[in-house]
Amino acid sequence: DTHKSEVAHRFKDLGEEHFKGLVLVAFSQYLQQCPFEEHVKLVNEVTEFAKTCVADESAENCDKSLHTLFGDKLCTVATLRETYGEMADCCAKQEPERNECFLQHKDDNPNLPPLVRPEVDVMCTAFHDNEATFLKKYLYEVARRHPYFYAPELLFFAARYKAAFAECCQAADKAACLLPKLDELRDEGKASSAKQRLKCASLQKFGDRAFKAWAVARLSQKFPKAEFAEVSKLVTDLTKVHTECCHGDLLECADDRADLAKYMCENQDSISSKLKECCDKPLLEKSHCLAEVENDEMPADLPSLAADYVESKDVCKNYAEAKDVFLGMFLYEYARRHPDYSVMLLLRLAKAYEATLEKCCAAADPHECYAKVFDEFQPLVEEPQNLVKQNCELFEQLGEYKFQNALLVRYTKKVPQVSTPTLVEVSRNLGKVGAKCCKLPEAKRMPCAEDYLSVVLNRLCVLHEKTPVSEKVTKCCTESLVNRRPCFSALELDEAYVPKAFNAETFTFHADMCTLSEKEKQVKKQTALVELVKHKPKATKEQLKGVMDNFAAFVEKCCKADDKEACFAEEGPKFVAASQAALA
């Protein structure tokens, strides 16, 4: 359905509030260093222009594409060259190359200060003084730090943020009410950002076939009663939504996401019995709820898969006639029977099945060749099962902090060239899998753990792509999306790595250590641990444990001292000398 004016069409569909929010997010994700006020000005100008097009779709420039309109607006920023360097060259290009250029310059790790949370009273005053500006600032600050955040979902977070302040700024104990809500939003927001980043990486690095396969598997697990044709329709629509959001087409994305939610709610009977409570909610909440909905119950008496995919004489004929559809049906049938498998495992099984058919259907006796294909799945299934079992046992034995430390050591030995902050961030997040997944029942552990690890390892891949330092990381990140986690798991100590020279400065600590929060203290200690492993990659677990125990004791001792700084100055060098001796 073509419209004379795309901008008028989207303004009318989305409404002014969502239109302005999404344009602000789009601009903040593209120009991550621009001050808030500059973005607000640009958004207001675009909004006023959109209103003129709503009034008269034939008005000047109203027929231009959104990329043209938004790109032209971004290119009016005066300090583009000084602030963004070569990104300014994008403005010399024509669409669609200009938008592609902006997309390529999105920075996953922008050099922005961490957000500090003001006092509750200060926040409540700001909220009451100018609610609209307060909420816009939230969208801006999140979007510029998370340039791939799923925009319609960010509007939902902003609505929750607003609700938290509206409720808690009236409460008797504002802090007790507000702070847990803000913590929850922060943690959920980081998780949402990371999950969306994997979707965008999947689409951009591996193409829409990879994303569609992921979506078939996941939606088949969620909606095992739905027919394959229904799942396929949802997959096609969902792929369009995410392709648009990942491509910076946030207005189209939000509009199409709303259409998809509407469709799902109008067709609940042929999708899932679990959608009812989502469908009574307002739009943003409804879309969020549908995305997070629990798996429906599996239909009773599902027949064995072997009949259609191993025993049938038509396997090769059917495969040859429509390879992707046949594999899609296989994936759908396997996934709906296995909510206990991770999506990545299901995709590995589909890949193995495809490889077998490619080989066997060209053979003299295809059936004889592929008769045992399901037996070949067993090692693929057992590998993540064993990995989850072993790591959950380790987590239960060590607790989260020490489990993170074990992973820090493991991953630093595998890829010691990676920067210390990246290794700390990624390993800390890998370690959170324990608390997140190990408490779950057996049937939910693998999908929780492996699919979470895929999200975390994608973060490593994205950061590493910006500044590549390790061929092994590049290989694991680029060869196969579904085999990334097994690829990293299989990496051993890097024998070619030349240990980092010892630098006493890295292991020098001061009294400010004592005023840090528990989390910040952990990060300091974990940073030291990574540097230690980079210096002595062949250090044993026992040696490293000894050094870390001494470190904890040294910090505790000095933080209890009257003259803390003097203690650090005196005890620090002793700790360093003792550590060097212990690791010699």
Partner: nanobody, 123 residues
Framework: QVQLQESGGGLVQPGGSLRLSCAAS????????MVWVRQATGKGLEWVST????????RYADSVNGRFTISRDNAENTLYLLMNSLKPEDTAVYYC????????????????RGQGTQVTVSS
């Protein structure tokens, strides 16, 4: 839109040969599996042969196996069916076909098909 145009049919004596061609356009021929099906007067569609996108996988109905050869030229967007040792029971309209999104695999009534070319085997 998808277009399939068969040619090469005709009247041939039992034991004779024909080569059918199918010119394809309007879709990604080089990544699509292709099929020959046939329909004798008063009968339903009968599957004859299938070839995969890259020609690695080829299947024939038992009734034509050893006599017919399917092939394709992806550069020319053309599908072929070489028919040797023709029998009277091979008399039918021959269609080339390709999978239509949303249809069931093997449900040839729902596939994209051309207009067909008549093959008559008679002495």
């Amino acid at each position: 839109q998808v277009q399939l145009q068969e040619s090469g049919g005709g009247l041939v004596q039992p034991g004779g040969s024909l080569r059918l061609s199918c010119a394809a356009s309007g879709f990604a021929f080089s990544t699509s599996g292709m099929v020959w099906v046939r329909q004798a007067t008063g009968k339903g569609l009968e599957w004859v042969s299938t070839i995969s996108d890259d020609s690695r996988i080829i299947r024939y109905a038992d009734s034509v196996n050893g006599r017919f050869t399917i092939s394709r030229d992806n550069a020319e967007n053309t599908l072929y069916l070489l028919m040797n040792s023709l029998k009277p029971e091979d008399t039918a309209v021959y269609y080339c076909a390709t999978y239509r999104a949303g249809s069931r695999i093997g449900s040839y009534e729902d596939y994209y098909r051309g207009q067909g070319t008549q093959v008559t085997v008679s002495s």
